[in-house]
Amino acid sequence: MAKAAAIGIDLGTTYSCVGVFQHGKVEIIANDQGNRTTPSYVAFTDTERLIGDAAKNQVALNPQNTVFDAKRLIGRKFGDPVVQSDMKHWPFQVINDGDKPKVQVSYKGETKAFYPEEISSMVLTKMKEIAEAYLGYPVTNAVITVPAYFNDSQRQATKDAGVIAGLNVLRIINEPTAAAIAYGLDRTGKGERNVLIFDLGGGTFDVSILTIDDGIFEVKATAGDTHLGGEDFDNRLVNHFVEEFKRKHKKDISQNKRAVRRLRTACERAKRTLSSSTQASLEIDSLFEGIDFYTSITRARFEELCSDLFRSTLEPVEKALRDAKLDKAQIHDLVLVGGSTRIPKVQKLLQDFFNGRDLNKSINPDEAVAYGAAVQAAILMGDKSENVQDLLLLDVAPLSLGLETAGGVMTALIKRNSTIPTKQTQIFTTYSDNQPGVLIQVYEGERAMTKDNNLLGRFELSGIPPAPRGVPQIEVTFDIDANGILNVTATDKSTGKANKITITNDKGRLSKEEIERMVQEAEKYKAEDEVQRERVSAKNALESYAFNMKSAVEDEGLKGKISEADKKKVLDKCQEVISWLDANTLAEKDEFEHKRKELEQVCNPIISGLYQGAGGPGPGGFGAQGPKGGSGSGPTIEEVD
């Protein structure tokens, strides 16, 4: 058997995506709902744990126990201002456990608290399972992507999430780097090119500038807005229609969570429509107090509602250009990543900013990061395909790295956006006369004072011979390898005495024991989830079949072909089953299957009678087989408000 493939996972804030490089090309893998991206959502209910589409679909019914945005928490401390700010907007509870944030939910009647790593591991498990269902064998090796601005703690926590999910994380790589790989595969051999990657996703916005030269990628600069994305555009539409509803019906729906959720779902759909059409309609039955809300919106109105947000995307572009010391004329290629880059106005603003330069839209924006991660996974697994064998990945240090000098000053040895692997050495000295040792405190960050940056670790170099201040020469070397692991060495040049620290950022990380416990819990949840998956599958099969049958016999084209008695028989039974389903969503698998078989017993003979002699089987998904045929349960896809 061929060697098991490694996968590439784009672990996104709102959506995740998985790809695999095999047979010389990347396949982006669809989930069980047929979607090539999967919501980064985990929901906990009285009976089950849901991940992905199923979790997002029921968020309106169960907001306090539906967790998303784990990526905004991962690797951060509870007291982090970002965490404190984001917490205000989440419907789920975040608690403090030793300055580590944990998400507290109610699950199967009990209060449970999960680390962000555990939530992310559940999403990663889902992505792993999606890949395994497609490949047909277990998958363990993976490359996972993170934003370029993620610090070491966030990267390490993401890696831990992978371990909890049962993955061997080959490497954590930057999202823009991954997108550049996806873009660069078919761009080798054209000399050095500067590429600007414009990544506007569901909840975040990142701009990166890279150079690509004959398969060698180098990140030059990164910038962005961690709270700008498709959801903000949805919000503008929601607010617009809340106001419209007020005007039309003199009622405020904004406090009704279910109504707002249903409106948001419709707005998201309308927004997508407006990327390809100049007008979109919304039709929401009984949105609020029995009132049907039928309305429409033009692309122009949408652009006006979001104009300031769209324009604001250009500020990080300018900042990245400044950081990379490039003029916009020096950018050869503009790459669009993230679903929101499909918005025509966003594309036009970017294109106009670059004086009409063509935008590269050859990569599906939702999939580019996973695509590149899949390629990188193949490289790391030793794939010899000519598409990838000449590719070399040069990543960057996302934040400046340095040490604290007198007065709490941050002295950077490795500047932000430096290509890694890299090694930098600098000479320091003592602050006091006869100082016997120095405390080397290693920080990452861009602030002038270390108190505003992130402490990675500290160590002492002692035994410095007595000398006046400023005389001893202490050589400090910062060395980052290709995996982003930092070694800091301090050497007293007069004695040759040295000490060092390896920063893998265990501080604030989960212990091996905690990770092991979480791995075991993940296994337990997986077994429960399997039972649940079968139950839901049986429910969906019943529901699909019932609605298919109902629409089949109501089809105008069948007038005169089906007796009124038979039609009534089918409709009555469908009504019975649909109503029973509404009242018994938590029924067991056996019950759903029993109801489906009962319904099939009534419907199949009638439906098959209609299509016999018509030169083919019944309509798709109806299961109008002859006796002893399959169950014909139809597609297992449903939409919940």
Partner: antibody
């Protein structure tokens, strides 16, 4: 007229197998499900499960999963109930019953006696 | 699973008198969409196969005398034999078909 005719009484030893048949007539066999019901001596009725005669898919009640198998032969409009690894507590009358809105037609019953 | 509890276990009624049998379900058998309760009643005379009397709580099967009637909703159901006849001596079973199927334990009706 509609009739369900079951096979005759059986006496079996523990560990053996038995196959009870139920032949339908007077209606289109594949249009209605066929249920199986057990009645131990002096006891009430126990629903064992049923078979979708159109698709051949069986459903078993919890207490009847494992040793029981329901099948059909649509060419002869006959339903079968197979029971293997017989035990003494399997001694009972086994009924087949057609299902429309309820079990509207019943077979006469087949007595299966398990005795060493 | 749904449990059906019949009461009484046995009942002695004079000829021509009314017999009332109760059946209590562990959960509601009402389907709000069809507004039907999925409960049926069967009669089994000694040495015979069961016979369907009533389905959907109160719909009499064709050929069943009108002295037999069913009522109830949700979890509580009743079979009434208005004027007991000799041929009504039997065991009566309720059965639910709301989800899967289950029979009640049976009620034996005799002549006093």
């Amino acid at each position: 007229q509609i009739q369900l005719v079951q096979s005759g009484s059986e006496v079996k030893k523990p560990g053996a197998s038995v196959k009870v048949s139920c032949k339908a007539s007077g209606y289109t066999f594949t249009n209605y499900g066929m249920n199986w019901v057990r009645q131990a001596p002096g006891q009430g009725l126990e629903w064992m499960g049923w078979i979708n005669t159109y698709t051949g898919e069986p459903t078993y009640a919890d207490d009847f999963k494992g040793r029981f198998t329901f099948t059909t032969d649509t060419s002869t409009s006959t339903a079968y109930m197979d029971l293997r690894s017989l035990r003494s507590d399997d001694t009972a009358v086994y009924f087949c019953a057609r299902y429309d809105h309820a079990m509207d037609y019943w077979g006469q019953g087949t007595l299966v006696t398990v005795s060493s | 699973e749904i449990v059906l509890t019949q009461s009484p276990d046995s009942l002695s009624v004079s000829l021509g008198e009314r017999a009332t049998i109760k059946c209590k379900s562990s959960q509601s058998l009402l389907n709000s969409g069809t507004r039907k309760n999925y409960l049926a009643w069967y009669q089994q005379k000694a040495g015979q196969s069961p016979k369907l009397l009533i389905y959907w709580t109160s719909t009499r099967e064709s050929g069943v005398p009108d002295r037999f009637s069913g009522s109830g909703s949700g979890t509580d159901f009743t079979l009434t034999i208005d004027s007991l006849q000799t041929e009504d001596v039997a065991v009566y079973y309720c059965k639910q078909s709301y989800t899967l199927y289950t029979f009640g334990g049976g009620t034996k009706v005799e002549i006093k």
